[in-house]
């Protein structure tokens, strides 16, 4: 039975040109994490394999950095980065756990309306 739960950074609103960290944390299970995939819509961004370490998809190499931990750092954000991001934890023996994060990248003029917020 799958008892684990995924906690995420929560949805994030960021400004164009900035950088953000996406993180997920798997808790309430003793299952072993064999691999974590980070995906955006249907695109694979990065893989962190327990044995082989990190692999960043070639098309994202310039703007995606591994970590901290099993998280992912996105840099030089563009409005085009707006969308849903998935952390997919492959575990043994439980199977697959998935977390979802919505990232909203705003033009500076739009972001100013939320000036009282910490905008990454």
């Amino acid at each position: 039975m799958m008892t684990g739960t995924i906690e995420t950074t929560g949805n994030i609103s960021a400004e164009k040109g900035g950088s953000i960290i996406l993180q997920c944390h798997l808790s309430s299970t003793t299952a072993q994490v064999t691999q974590v995939n980070w995906e955006q819509q249907d695109q694979l961004l990065a893989i962190c394999n327990a044995d082989l370490g990190w692999h960043i998809s070639p098309s994202f190499k310039d703007r995606v950095a591994p970590g901290p931990g099993l998280g992912l750092t996105l840099q030089s954000l563009t409005v085009n980065d707006t969308g849903e991001y998935f952390c997919i934890y492959h575990t043994y023996p439980d199977g697959t756990y998935t977390g979802r994060i919505f990232l909203e990248v705003l033009e500076s003029s739009v972001a100013e309306h939320g000036a009282r917020f910490q905008i990454p």
Partner: antibody
Framework: EVQLQQSGPELVKPGASMKISCKAS????????MNWVKQSHGKNLEWIGL????????SYNQKFKGKATLTVDKSSNTAYMDLLSLTSEDSAVYYC???????????WGQGTLVTVSA | DVVVTQTPLSLPVSFGDQVSISCRSS???????????LSWYLHKPGQSPQLLIY???NRFSGVPDRFSGSGSGTDFTLKISTIKPEDLGLYYC?????????FGAGTKLELK
């Protein structure tokens, strides 16, 4: 002035599908996500999902996956929601709303009443 | 999904009263950057919902200062200091920190 103009009320038969439109004016359409909200029984509000007009990226409430499909036409500043295989449970008022995570849903369409009945 | 519990569901008032509506979430609404995406709406019959408060405590443009929001983490409150006739209707809170976004069940503000 920000305006979201939705298509008119619809009476549809069970099993049919339909499309609701939401025409935006008074702001830069690609700069804001468009959200869709369902209001049933005159009270409950449910978030269906959102679409980012800039790149077409979507995020759905899993409850509405397979029921609603969100699209945009940037050339006409219009967001669309397709509702599929309608049943009486889908009878409701549907709203499009412009928002950001920061400011919430600041502007709303007037709502589209959908009645599913044989 | 994050469950948003709104209380009370019904709130009988007289004009001039001060009232509070509570909104509690099943997990913290602060994201990893310390931002909390919690907003409040008023829905009057025959109209579309209107934004009152965003980011816990920021009044949307044109919203009278008799409306105020407060709270943190999982516990949030909307206060209306002096009830006027145009304040009657359904009040909802919405959390935007976690997917899917979720609304409270609504609080009906009605005359005693």
């Amino acid at each position: 002035e920000v305006q979201l103009q939705q298509s008119g009320p619809e009476l549809v038969k069970p099993g049919a599908s339909m499309k609701i439109s939401c025409k935006a004016s008074g702001f830069s359409f690609p700069g804001y996500t468009m959200n869709w909200v369902k209001q049933s029984h005159g009270k409950n509000l449910e978030w269906i999902g959102l679409i980012n007009p800039y790149n077409g990226a979507t995020s759905y409430n899993q409850k509405f996956k397979g029921k609603a499909t969100l699209t945009v036409d940037k050339s006409s500043n219009t967001a669309y929601m397709d509702l599929l295989s309608l049943t009486s449970e889908d009878s409701a008022v549907y709203y499009c709303t412009r928002g950001t995570l920061i400011t919430g849903f600041a502007y709303w369409g007037q709502g589209t009443l959908v009645t599913v009945s044989a | 999904d994050v469950v948003v519990t709104q209380t009370p569901l019904s709130l009988p008032v007289s004009f001039g009263d001060q009232v509070s509506i509570s909104c509690r979430s099943s997990q913290s609404l602060a994201n990893s950057y310390g931002n909390t995406y919690l907003s409040w709406y008023l829905h009057k019959p025959g109209q579309s919902p209107q934004l009152l408060i965003y980011g816990i405590s920021n009044r949307f443009s044109g919203v009278p200062d008799r409306f105020s929001g407060s709270g943190s983490g999982t516990d949030f409150t909307l206060k209306i200091s002096t009830i006027k006739p145009e304040d009657l209707g359904l009040y909802y809170c919405l959390q935007g920190t976690h997917l899917p976004l979720t609304f409270g069940a609504g609080t009906k503000l009605e005359l005693k």
